[in-house]
């Protein structure tokens, strides 16, 4: 297993609709054809997997149908979008990239993006 540098923004504020997008960029040492991207969430010392996708270079990322993540790839960049977020989902979202094929296997883990999520203010009661 060889190490690889992964860069991602330090801080992102999700939209009022609970959507957060960020780029995960990796310094590929070679010409990988198969890449696996995993998003991990760290909060209160607990790490959980949010979503993961394996893709062939030049093709779209394919997450599971019920995944809250979508993404696109361009060269050594992966543009990740996480939707359906609420204030309780605020936390550090870590991008993990694995170059699966061809060998050698490379692994890179970013420092994480602190995603802040604000629940929308409830609408004031109206007589109309």
């Amino acid at each position: 297993c060889k190490a690889m540098h992964v860069a991602q923004p330090a801080v992102v504020l999700a939209s009022s609709r609970g959507i957060a997008s960020f780029v995960c960029e990796y310094a590929s040492p070679g010409k990988a054809t198969e890449v696996r991207v995993t998003v991990l969430r760290q909060a209160d010392s607990q790490v959980t997997e949010v979503c993961a996708a394996t893709y062939m270079m030049g093709n779209e990322l394919t997450f599971l149908d019920d995944s809250i993540c979508t993404g696109t790839s361009s060269g050594n960049q992966v543009n990740l979008t996480i939707q359906g977020l609420r204030a309780m989902d605020t936390g550090l979202y870590i991008c993990k990239v694995e170059l699966m094929y061809p060998p050698p296997y490379y692994l890179g883990i970013g420092n994480g993006t602190q995603i802040y999520v604000i629940d929308p203010e409830p609408c004031p009661d109206s007589d109309f």
């Epitope: 801080v11 009022s16 209160d44 010392s45």
Partner: antibody
């Protein structure tokens, strides 16, 4: 090294608006947020809101909602805070700070005086 | 919104003494994302401690932070003349970010 440099002191009349700038250098501007904090004479720190320089999304303190606008110009790595309908109790030093996410770097502060 | 309460309001001590400052949150601070800042008259605040217990770059080791959940402490092991200032705690675990009212450490 990381630096946040703010615009100079302003004197305004009640009802007017003020726009304070905060120019960042020494880091990738869009990777962080910029928060605005004010301090009235002899008082504590009051958080006003912040902007994510990555996407321009904002979150304002409820007290300032509708009266404040925070923006960024990523081409010049500059953040702006505009406060409208100024009152005498808006007289304060206004600080910008990098959201890293702790507020790890601060501007030198901009004194805004509101007086008729 | 998380409300932070600091105590005492003022702490009168002599150089060389230990200072213990308290910060209490109205609800648990997410990931212990609590910071301490020092502010001297006419200056911008300076980050001392983040993540409840990590010292910021260039901060002397006489400053230490501890605590978790809702109760946090800043300790200055031996006060130096330059440590007399106002200290603020702040939570950045959730937005809105909030500050405590501050503790003034002055010379006895």
């Amino acid at each position: 090294q990381v630096q946040l440099v703010q615009s100079g002191a302003e004197e305004k009349k009640p009802g007017a608006a003020v726009k304070v700038s905060c120019k960042a250098s020494g880091y990738t501007f869009t990777s962080y947020g910029i928060s605005w904090v004010r301090q009235a004479p002899g008082q504590g720190l009051e958080w006003m809101g912040w902007i994510s320089a990555y996407n321009g999304n904002t979150h304002y303190a409820q007290k300032f909602q509708g009266r404040v606008t925070m923006t960024t110009d990523t081409s010049t790595s500059t953040a702006y805070m505009e406060l409208r309908s100024l009152r005498s109790d808006d007289t304060a030093v206004y600080y910008c700070a990098r959201v890293g996410p702790p507020f790890d770097y601060w501007g030198q502060g901009t004194l805004v005086t509101v007086s008729s | 919104e998380i409300v932070l309460t600091q105590s005492p309001g003022t702490l009168s001590l002599s150089p060389g003494e230990r200072a213990i400052l308290s910060c209490r949150a109205s609800q648990s601070v997410s990931s212990n994302y609590l910071a301490w800042y020092q502010q001297k008259p006419g200056q911008a605040p300076r980050l001392l401690i983040y993540g409840a217990s990590s010292r910021a770059t260039g901060i002397p080791d006489r400053f230490s932070g501890s605590g978790s959940g809702t109760d946090f402490t800043l300790t200055i092991s031996r006060l130096e003349p330059e440590d007399f200032a106002v200290y603020y705690c702040q939570q950045y675990g959730n937005s809105p970010f909030t500050f405590g009212p501050g503790t003034k450490v002055d010379i006895k």
